[in-house]
Amino acid sequence: NQDLPVIKCVLINHKNNDSSVGKSSSYPMVSESPEDLGCALRPQSSGTVYEAAAVEVDVSASITLQVLVDAPGNISCLWVFKHSSLNCQPHFDLQNRGVVSMVILKMTETQAGEYLLFIQSEATNYTILFTVSIRNTLLYTLRRPYFRKMENQDALVCISESVPEPIVEWVLCDSQGESCKEESPAVVKKEEKVLHELFGTDIRCCARNELGRECTRLFTIDLNQTPQTTLPQLFLKVGEPLWIRCKAVHVNHGFGLTWELENKALEEGNYFEMSTYSTNRTMIRILFAFVSSVARNDTGYYTCSSSKHPSQSALVTIVEKGFINATNSSEDYEIDQYEEFCFSVRFKAYPQIRCTWTFSRKSFPCEQKGLDNGYSISKFCNHKHQPGEYIFHAENDDAQFTKMFTLNIRRKPQVLAEASASQASCFSDGYPLPSWTWKKCSDKSPNCTEEITEGVWNRKANRKVFGQWVSSSTLNMSEAIKGFLVKCCAYNSLGTSCETILLNSPGPFPFIQDN
């Protein structure tokens, strides 16, 4: 049909970038390139109906459904979703194509369904059908990778039993400490399952799919390094594989390594050795201790010894169930308005936790850092000095943990006043919670020094705004003060703030703030 317009349907996926986390309005800023949805004419349908390819969206993802119309003249349009019509405002792009968009922010179950777009151009009318569903991630899993020895080869295979099939990569680093951070130039990534180069300083394997990324580090004892000041500890659950690598470098090949568990040499078949010469002609030896499926009796001190190095040990603890150990008592903090401060939680957990920080129903990303003593720490500094309740929540496959924090910001009270025909009220949010005084201004007391004590009702902390306490004081009006100016003052250790109210007839009252 010659009269039919050329139309294109596209899907734009928006990345909810972190700067918008915790902002309610945020139109997603960062977009990925549009995905063509085809938009084919639907056969055997009454009228002209185009059907876009089905769209599957992750929960909480933000998308735009967009139609580009190459037709002469103006167009008008209407979106219909679940029998409700939605506003539609076409505009024109640089190629003079009509552009119609439907933005869905933070996809939920209720936003899934059929979106119908009715377009009327000068030449013809037609309908475009989009079907939007939520991707079924209930069946998705992302499991922490584990290691296996490759049959008949000195190599490790990295396995992650996840759905959908994850991308597996080895993350290798040959320098010490901080320089082995993920984005450091010292870090090399290899997107493959098998690793032959097992002599590096730091070896991790990571698996990633739609659910995120999980990594496992190859636990290593380096006999050329001074031992940690605290005993290195490795936790595993019954049935998981155990891998410990012992590494030593010496000027020549004349040295050997051995593994012991509680003074007994490991059995044949539970270890294998590899050696190589490094660039400066020194000999590097590594000796792996491994158990394909650990039992409770594999718990104990594993000691790696050498004929040319001091021995070192690690404690392997086999648990039936994962755990999160931390103190869950709530903590209250009081800081100044410009004081630098971070909440922190120190915990020991296995398997590794997933965590969030929450304030005022908004979630913030949670970072965790391993400490030398086997503990990890998560800090939250992005409170922007907003008082209230902050919640740390952590979970792993077997355990959950929640800890509450209260942040109070020390500041001088700010007073707001309101009045009705029968009473005047003042509110303040300063901290520490303020005390109140009411004063009457009259000819006898032009400086408002005459204190009012009758009819005053103070309510401390009577309402919580995002966890922030507000204090109020109410003065019931009596004949003695009607028509006078009264002054309410809130004071705490940081200062005083007052508001003056004219007590006359109902209606708007002039308020004069004196600080």
Partner: nanobody, 111 residues
Framework: QVQLQESGGGLVQAGGSLTLSCTAS????????FSWYRQAPGKQRELVAF???????IDVESVKGRFTISGDNDKNTAYLQMNGLKPEDTAVYYC?????WGQGTQVTVSS
């Protein structure tokens, strides 16, 4: 849980001698896993001497011929015999055994 108890530190004149002992409790004892480290103020902890997996006493270059590590399996104790002490040997001396550290004993060598 292994407990390590060091003793024998003190103040000594240059050229003098001291013997440090380290007694282990709470674990089956094997002299092969003992080592001595030291930490001078503002410096990293460094290896001084150890007993290798084949029972040989090994000391590092800076103390060669002056320090000797030995042990007594019956007493669950390792020793560090220090002769010809120099001011640069001043440090806190720690013993290490099976992942655990002693609390340290101060050795001060005056010139």
């Amino acid at each position: 849980q292994v407990q390590l108890q060091e003793s024998g530190g003190g103040l000594v004149q240059a050229g003098g001698s001291l013997t440090l002992s380290c007694t282990a409790s709470g674990s089956t004892f094997s002299i092969n896993h003992f080592s001595w480290y030291r930490q001078a103020p503002g410096k990293q902890r460094e290896l001084v001497a150890f007993i290798s997996s084949d029972g040989v006493s090994i000391d590092v270059e800076s103390v060669k011929g002056r320090f000797t590590i030995s042990g007594d399996n019956d007493k669950n104790t390792a020793y560090l015999q220090m002769n010809g002490l120099k001011p640069e040997d001043t440090a806190v001396y720690y013993c290490y055994y099976r992942g655990f550290w002693g609390q340290g004993t101060q050795v001060t060598v005056s010139s």
